[in-house]
């Protein structure tokens, strides 16, 4: 049978030929009658065999990290017969390890983030070195980790490479640290090989700083003409934290929040002072408000850093603006009777300069030839008024500061012209009618009505009468219906067309005004030749009416 021990060859041997061991058959009596052969990958190139003795040699420098074992085949042949003495057999050559590889950190670069103010013992990151040497061969690949840079803030567990915090750190003082870790093989014994890596440790922010106003006093100004919602200035607090932890909210302490407000610009983290209610220089020309600031997000466990909110005082000066005159009333309504003489008093308007210098005021009435106004605001008529032409005047009064004619205010002025009884009633239309020659007494020949251009406080009431002459010449009579109409009736029997073809009746119409006015109105009555049925046969009036296009009924 075959006789051999396990074969080992140390790696990295520099000799041209290194004896590994011997392969031999127990039938070999040492008389050089057997021939040994080596077959397989590496035979002849990496390993050779002494054909006579079976001694095996490595003729190449081997690298265990490249290849740690070779499986070869051995043959032994009887030189005399050429036959195999033993069956072909496989054997293994193992490459034994030497400590020729330093530890390497293969997962570089290392970077970790840990919250600032983390307590001692907090795990930061684990670094791992690899050693290409054989972990089963002594201590060649047994590593120990140590810290070359990073004390006193960090420590490393010697066997695991776990980096932990060993002292609290404040991001606001230093926000990142470079830690250098060394890995040594041979568990750090003499002759050990080492490798190093750098770890960038960044501190993430926690909200351990409250915002603080940079200034204890801000001076701002606002124009009294500024509308509500106007931004009048900004205030700024500073927070040493970053990101969400530096987001802040500004507010005004409750007692001061009537006239002003503060809103927060979350992009710039500024407080914007806003006008909440209009200010008036003449009423109050300065204000003092106290603002406070606090963080938007504060976890419960960090409230200890945020007990007292930072405050600042804001002095706001109101800037005087030359304001236009201010009328006592938003509009004026005056009444004046029609037909009052030119220069009659209508009313008084009044405007004042709201500013402290109290400029005198001048007044004017726009687009009016009917009214005048003087520097005292007294309005008078410049023409006689006729209510029946215009019952209302819609005007505009302008007040101008004497010292600054650009400061103008205007308000509406309404003047109502009151009625006086200056128009007598009249026929509501032109009346012209006819009477038949054969008309009997008491026959109604016309109903009349009247109108009056005056305005009546009560309803108009008209009174109808015949004139004195017509009353005496009693061919016709009138009856007042008491409803502002009257009827004309014949007062005799029979009329003669040839003798008296037309009658002109004067009718007096009086109104119920004080004093009462009366007008005389003429009613024309034509005499016609009528048939038995009452239809007109011959009538100058009819021809007249037909030629003029009047209706006869």
């Amino acid at each position: 049978g075959w006789v051999w021990n396990q074969f080992f060859v140390p790696e990295e041997m520099n000799t041209t030929s290194h004896h590994i061991g011997q392969l031999r058959s127990d039938l070999d009596n040492g008389n050089n009658s057997f021939q040994y052969k080596l077959l397989g990958a590496g035979a002849g190139s990496t390993f050779i065999i002494d054909e006579r003795t079976g001694d095996i040699y490595a003729i190449q420098k081997l690298d265990r990290e490249e290849r740690s074992l070779y499986i070869l085949r051995a043959q032994v042949i009887d030189i005399a017969t050429g036959r195999a003495v033993e069956p072909e057999s496989e054997f293994v050559i193992k490459v034994s390890d030497i400590n020729d590889n330093e530890p390497k950190f293969l997962d570089e670069p290392y970077e970790a983030i840990v919250p600032e103010m983390s307590p001692e013992g907090t795990l930061v990151i684990q670094v791992t070195a690899s050693d290409a040497d054989d972990p089963s061969s002594g201590n060649n690949a047994r590593l120990l980790y140590s810290l070359l840079q990073g004390q006193p803030y960090f420590s490393v567990e010697p066997t695991t490479g776990v980096i932990r915090i060993s002292s609290k750190m404040d991001r606001e003082l230093q926000d990142e640290y470079w830690v250098i870790i060394q890995a040594k093989d041979m568990i750090g014994q003499p002759g050990a090989l080492s490798g190093t890596t750098s770890v960038l440790i960044k501190l993430s922010d926690v909200n351990d700083n409250k915002p603080i106003f940079k200034e204890s006093l801000y001076r701002l100004t606002v124009s009294e003409s500024a509308p509500t919602g106007t931004s009048i200035g900004t205030i700024m607090a500073y927070d040493n934290d970053i990101g969400e932890n530096a987001e802040m909210d500004y507010s005004i302490e409750e007692d001061d929040s009537q006239t002003f407000d503060i809103i927060t610009n979350h992009e710039t983290q500024e407080g914007i002072v806003i006008l909440k209610k209009k200010v008036d220089f003449e009423h109050q020309n300065h204000y003092g408000i106290r603002a406070k600031v606090k963080n938007h997000h504060v976890p419960e466990q960090l409230m200890k850093y945020h007990t007292e909110a930072s405050t600042t005082f804001i002095k706001i000066q109101v800037e005087d603006v030359d304001e236009p005159p201010l009328f006592l009333l938003p509009y004026y309504v005056f009444e004046v009777f029609e037909e009052t003489p030119q220069g009659s008093f209508v009313g008084v308007v009044s405007a004042t300069d709201p500013d402290n210098r109290k400029s005198p005021i001048r007044y004017s009435i726009t687009r009016s030839k009917v009214f005048n106004i003087n520097d005292n605001g007294t309005i008078t008529t410049s023409n006689s008024l006729d209510r029946e032409i215009s019952a209302w005047y819609n005007l505009s009064i302008t007040a101008t500061e004497k010292y600054n004619i650009e400061q103008i205010s205007s308000i509406p002025l309404y003047v109502q012209v009151l009625n006086i009884n200056d128009h007598a009633p009249e026929f509501s239309q032109y009346y012209e009618t006819y009477v038949c020659e054969n008309a009997g007494s008491g026959q109604v020949i016309q109903t009349i009505s009247a109108v009056d251009r005056d305005e009546s406080i009560e309803e108009h009431h008209f009174y109808f009468n015949l004139s004195v002459e017509d009353t005496n010449n009693s061919s016709f009579t009138i009856i007042d219906n008491q409803d502002n109409t009257a009827v004309i009736l014949t007062n005799r029997t029979g009329f003669n067309l040839q003798e008296e073809p037309v009658f002109y009746i004067s009718i007096l119409i009086a109104d119920n005004g004080i004093p009462s006015l009366t007008s005389t109105n003429t009613l024309t009555i034509h005499v016609c030749d009528c048939g038995d049925s009452g239809s007109t046969q011959t009538c100058q009036y009819q021809e007249l009416v037909l030629s003029m296009g009047f209706k006869t009924e």
Epitope: L39, G40, A41, A43, D63, E65, E66, A132
Partner: antibody
Framework: QVQLQESGPGLVKPSQTLSLTCTVS??????????WSWIRQHPGKGLEWIGY???????YYNPSLKSRVTISVDTSKNQFSLKLSSVTAADTAVYYC????????????WGQGTLVTVSS | EIVLTQFPGTLSLSPGERATLSCRAS???????LAWYQQKPGQAPRLLIY???SRATGIPDRFSGSGSGTDFTLTISRLEPEDFAVYYC?????????FGGGTKLEIK
Amino acid sequence: QVQLQESGPGLVKPSQTLSLTCTVSGGSISRGGYYWSWIRQHPGKGLEWIGYIFYRGRTYYNPSLKSRVTISVDTSKNQFSLKLSSVTAADTAVYYCARVNSNYGWFDPWGQGTLVTVSS
Amino acid sequence: EIVLTQFPGTLSLSPGERATLSCRASQSVSSSYLAWYQQKPGQAPRLLIYGASSRATGIPDRFSGSGSGTDFTLTISRLEPEDFAVYYCQQYGSSPLTFGGGTKLEIK
């Protein structure tokens, strides 16, 4: 896990040099115990081993191609490369890169392969 | 160089049947140095068996390998539709490293 990806021109002119790169991801090329290999497969044919390299630079080539083949490694980029000079149409093939167990010689994993055509 | 001869060149079987693929070496190869691969069209080869009989990670147990010296066998106990492919053997026992010519396993 380790993955391999071949890259390079799909068309090479005769007599020129074919150049391919294999990028290793999911693991370091610098770990011991493995060779980094190139294999090719002619269209419709079997597999032919070209050669391999250890990350420290030692190379092993198929004697049939040895005069024309160079395999190199760039550990900083986790890549290894193949150069095949003086190509002819007979070098048209799908070229694969693969990791080889250095003790027992099996190929795993493989890249997905890249077809290189040699034509003018 | 060691020449690996695979036979049959083509094997026609139906799903559910047993497949036996052979690989013969021109000279003795250590069983530790023999591997089997599966290749589907348009894909890279995939390691099935290493050391003549050890299944690679993720390979179903219907695949098994055996043999020593010069004769090695890949057996698929019960064919699944996805098993129809080309199979290659490969040796590492002698330089240069070589592959067999392949056996095409096709659906009958």
